[in-house]
């Protein structure tokens, strides 16, 4: 693995793709998606340590002023790197229709 | 404003663009920066409340399952929705050069 | 796992009705829906329409619109399609799929040989 | 209704030999396509969705690009189990549709 996706917290401990197994009413879909009823989530979960799948060089600098002033700025965030589409059959007025969603699953992640 | 845009926390604690004047000895670039000196580094800072400036349906699962099991997925975070390139004027080998950078000064943010 | 397992093969003559049925196992039969795809003798795939077992809502291809009716028991875990006014040309292997989240499937059924014949 | 168009019809491929299909949509369909491979007598298997994403336990020999209307399935060295009939997915819209095939045979 390249440096920048070592975690020195330890494993599974700083950002990485995640499964949640979530039904359609914890997502608050259940009055208008009739298939799935359940959806495994894929998301991004984890810390961002200094280094660690660093987006760009806005990540690095965020992390720079993070160490000098922790109050004032954030460390890196976890956060979708790319997104895998998603098919839902959902209720429409006329019937039932086929959507994709291209920004609901998480592909990959990094830090921002 | 937009709903989306409109902070429940009180004026400047959700997710939006801030200015932290940093030198380059607090990017840790003062070895291989020449100018400027002194950057405005404009980042993301502040608190992603529900439906506060969602970045898209990812973030609104997010939020979503966050309420549910707050130990387990994280809020939504604020990152850069995109950025303003930068110019530095940097060393190299042979001399000086002039340098853009895509990806280093935050324009705009969201919650994803 | 996932199991999708269909009735045998049956034998028709023009005009009468088949009922395919399809039992589902290894996941929450109401979590997802049922597509049914059949392939004349080879031929290709044709997508005949959908079910959700949770609602009973359907979709139909517009060509068996009339024709074709999908049903879900879910005491049973169960899907059934029926096609009516049988022609030769529905002679066919029939499949029922389960849907995903993903678009593509990788659950299909055995699949059912349905012949109609004089 | 979308009509996936598939290319060639039958394709001679050597074993080892990479192989490459097409398949193009009348309309676009966006990412939102399918690869199966199917052998006489089974069910069909999935291989690719999403126009580039393998299915669980599929080979990396096999790839899918593209993305709108135009689409490719590629297998980079033929195995003696790949030969088989191929088929695209479409399911951007309903209702959804198949191409017509590609059978990959033993040249």
């Known amino acids: 693995a390249r440096n920048g996706d070592r975690c020195p917290l330890g494993p599974g401990r700083c950002c990485r793709l995640h499964t949640v197994h979530a039904s359609l009413e914890d997502l608050g879909w259940a009055d208008w998606v009739l298939s799935p009823r359940e959806v495994q989530v894929t998301m991004c979960i984890g810390a961002c340590p200094s280094q660690f799948r660093e987006a760009n060089m806005h990540a690095q600098i965020k992390m720079n002023l993070h160490r000098l002033k922790p109050d004032t700025v954030p460390a890196p965030c976890c956060v979708p790197a790319s997104y895998n589409p998603m098919v839902l059959i959902q209720k429409t007025d006329t019937g039932v229709s086929l959507q994709t969603y291209d920004d609901l699953l998480a592909k990959d992640c990094h830090c921002v | 404003a937009r709903n989306g845009d409109r902070c429940p926390l009180g004026p400047g604690r959700c997710c939006r663009l801030h200015t932290v004047h940093a030198s380059l000895e607090d990017l840790g670039w003062a070895d291989w920066v020449l100018s400027p000196r002194e950057v405005q580094v404009t980042m993301c800072i502040g608190a992603c409340p529900s439906q506060f400036r969602e970045a898209n349906m990812h973030a609104q699962i997010k939020m979503n399952l966050h309420r549910l099991k707050p130990d387990t997925v994280p809020a939504p975070c604020c990152v850069p929705a995109s950025y303003n390139p930068m110019v530095l004027i940097q060393k190299t080998d042979t001399g000086v050069s002039l340098q853009t950078y895509d990806d280093l000064l935050a324009k705009d943010c969201h919650c994803v | 796992q996932v199991q999708l397992v269909q009735s045998g093969a049956e034998v028709k003559k023009p005009g009468a009705s088949v009922k395919v049925s399809c039992k589902a196992s290894g996941y929450t039969f109401t979590d997802y829906g049922i597509f049914w795809v059949r392939q004349a003798p080879g031929q290709g795939l044709e997508w005949m329409g959908w079910?959700?077992?949770?609602?009973?809502?359907?979709h139909y291809a517009q060509k068996l619109q009339g024709r074709v009716t999908m049903t879900t028991d879910t005491s049973t875990s169960t899907a059934y399609m029926e096609l009516r006014s049988l022609r030769s040309d529905d002679t066919a292997v029939y499949y029922c799929?389960?849907?995903?989240?993903?678009?593509?499937?990788?659950?299909w059924g055995q699949g059912t040989l349905v012949t109609v014949s004089s | 209704e979308i009509v996936m168009t598939q290319s060639p019809a039958t394709l001679s491929v050597s074993p080892g030999e990479r192989a490459t299909l097409s398949c193009r949509a009348s309309q676009s369909v966006s990412s939102n396509l399918a690869w199966y491979q199917q052998k006489p007598g089974q069910a069909p298997r999935l291989l690719i969705y999403g126009a580039s994403t393998r299915a669980t336990g599929i080979p990396a020999r096999f790839s899918g690009s593209g993305s709108g209307t135009e689409f490719t399935l590629t297998i980079s060295s033929l195995q003696s189990e790949d030969f088989a009939v191929y088929y695209c997915?479409?399911?951007?819209?309903?209702?959804?549709?198949f191409g017509g095939g590609t059978k990959v045979e033993i040249k």
């Open positions: 079910i959700t077992a949770y609602s009973g809502d359907t």
């Open positions: 799929v389960r849907d995903t989240q993903y678009g593509g499937s990788p659950y």
């Open positions: 997915q479409q399911y951007n819209n309903w209702p959804i549709t």
